[in-house]
């Protein structure tokens, strides 16, 4: 929907979990509500408990089975309902078609880790997490160093198009301080967008050898 | 966007059964959720019944459920309101709605509205 007030948006992290926002202005705060989602072609149905996060906000994970069990498909279609209990009966709040493998936000990438490192350089090495066996080789990622002195936001995106799951960085400073994120996102998708930032990982450049210059 | 445009109204006796059509147009039809909604003479609009374009699920009004019918046909890009048992309190101009990405998350917020087609229902 245009209007920004309410939206009902949900992402499938390709292999077993649908996570779901509600926003909904002038909402009651202490209303049960929940997300049921409904499978045109499966014999199982999901519940989960919107909580909120925030004054007009609410959100739940549907859990689909094991993490890395592939619990949908390309052609799968989930009808979502959020349902707020109004005295004995739940009222339908809001409804979608969700098509899975169009609203994909995978999981970030995990098990950061230095490879090697030099003076003006370093090599780390990443893993995706739950990620569909679906998308063979078609991923990208951003990456995004964290230099002295500056923010995350201020930090230049370096783009891998393809499923590389390690980067060399260059022309570091000798001796210093960083902090490195990677996120990924499929290429498959309309609505697809990209994980969440990966836990930093902290690493420090090698001294400059005393005599040499730098 | 999307364009929508109501047909089917007219004066019909109490007792008496109706269907409205809506023809949609535009690009993100095929994943949009469909709606009625009603709105008498000096009152506000009303939700009437929603209709998902994939799946055919449907939610309705309390005041409709059980005497009105919200189908599409996904080959002409239409969605109907089947209305039977109609009550005066039915009278109104009915409005065809389109909500689509990112959906809304209250079914009476829509993107697309067409201009309504009045039903009068006299006894």
């Known amino acids: 929907a245009v209007n920004g007030t309410s939206q009902f948006t949900c992402f499938y992290n390709s292999r077993a979990n649908i996570s779901c926002v509600w926003s909904q202005d002038g909402a009651l705060q202490d209303t049960s509500c929940q997300v049921h989602a409904w499978p045109d072609r499966r014999r199982w149905n999901q519940t989960c408990e919107l909580l909120p996060v925030s004054q007009a906000s609410w959100a739940c994970n549907l859990i689909l089975g094991a993490p890395d069990s592939q619990k949908l498909t390309t052609v799968d279609i989930v009808t979502l309902r959020v349902l707020c209990r109004e005295g004995v009966r739940w009222r339908v709040m809001a409804i979608q078609d969700f098509k899975p493998f169009e609203n994909l936000r995978l999981m970030a990438p995990i098990s950061l880790q230095v490879v090697h490192v030099e003076t003006h350089r370093c090599n780390i090495s990443w893993e995706i997490s739950q990620a569909s066996h679906y998308f063979e080789r078609h991923l990208e990622f951003e990456a995004r160093t964290l230099s002295p002195g500056h923010t995350w936001e201020e930090a230049p995106l370096l783009t891998l198009k393809q499923k590389q799951e390690w980067i060399c960085l260059e022309t570091l400073t000798p001796d210093t301080q960083y902090e490195f994120q990677v996120r990924v996102k499929p290429l498959q998708g309309e609505f697809t967008t990209w994980s969440p930032w990966s836990q930093p990982l902290a690493f420090r450049t090698k001294p400059a050898a005393l005599g040499k210059d730098t | 966007q999307v364009q929508l445009v109501e047909s089917g109204g007219g004066l019909v006796q109490v007792g008496d059964s109706l269907r409205l059509s809506c023809a949609a147009s535009?690009?993100?039809?095929?994943?949009?959720?469909m709606g009625w909604f009603r709105q008498a003479p000096g009152k506000e609009r009303e939700f009437v019944a929603v209709?998902?374009?994939?799946?055919?699920?449907?939610v309705y009004a309390d005041s409709v459920k059980g005497r009105f019918t919200i189908s599409r046909d996904n080959a002409k890009n239409t969605v109907y309101l089947d209305m039977s048992s109609l009550k005066p309190e039915d009278t109104a101009v009915y409005y065809c709605?389109?909500?689509?990405?990112?959906?809304?998350?209250?079914?009476?917020?829509?993107?697309?509205w067409g201009k309504g087609t009045l039903v009068t229902v006299s006894s």
């Open positions: 209709i998902t374009w994939s799946t055919g699920s449907t």
């Open positions: 709605a389109a909500d689509v990405y990112p959906y809304s998350g209250n079914l009476n917020i829509m993107d697309y």
């Open positions: 535009g690009r993100t039809v095929g994943s949009a959720n």
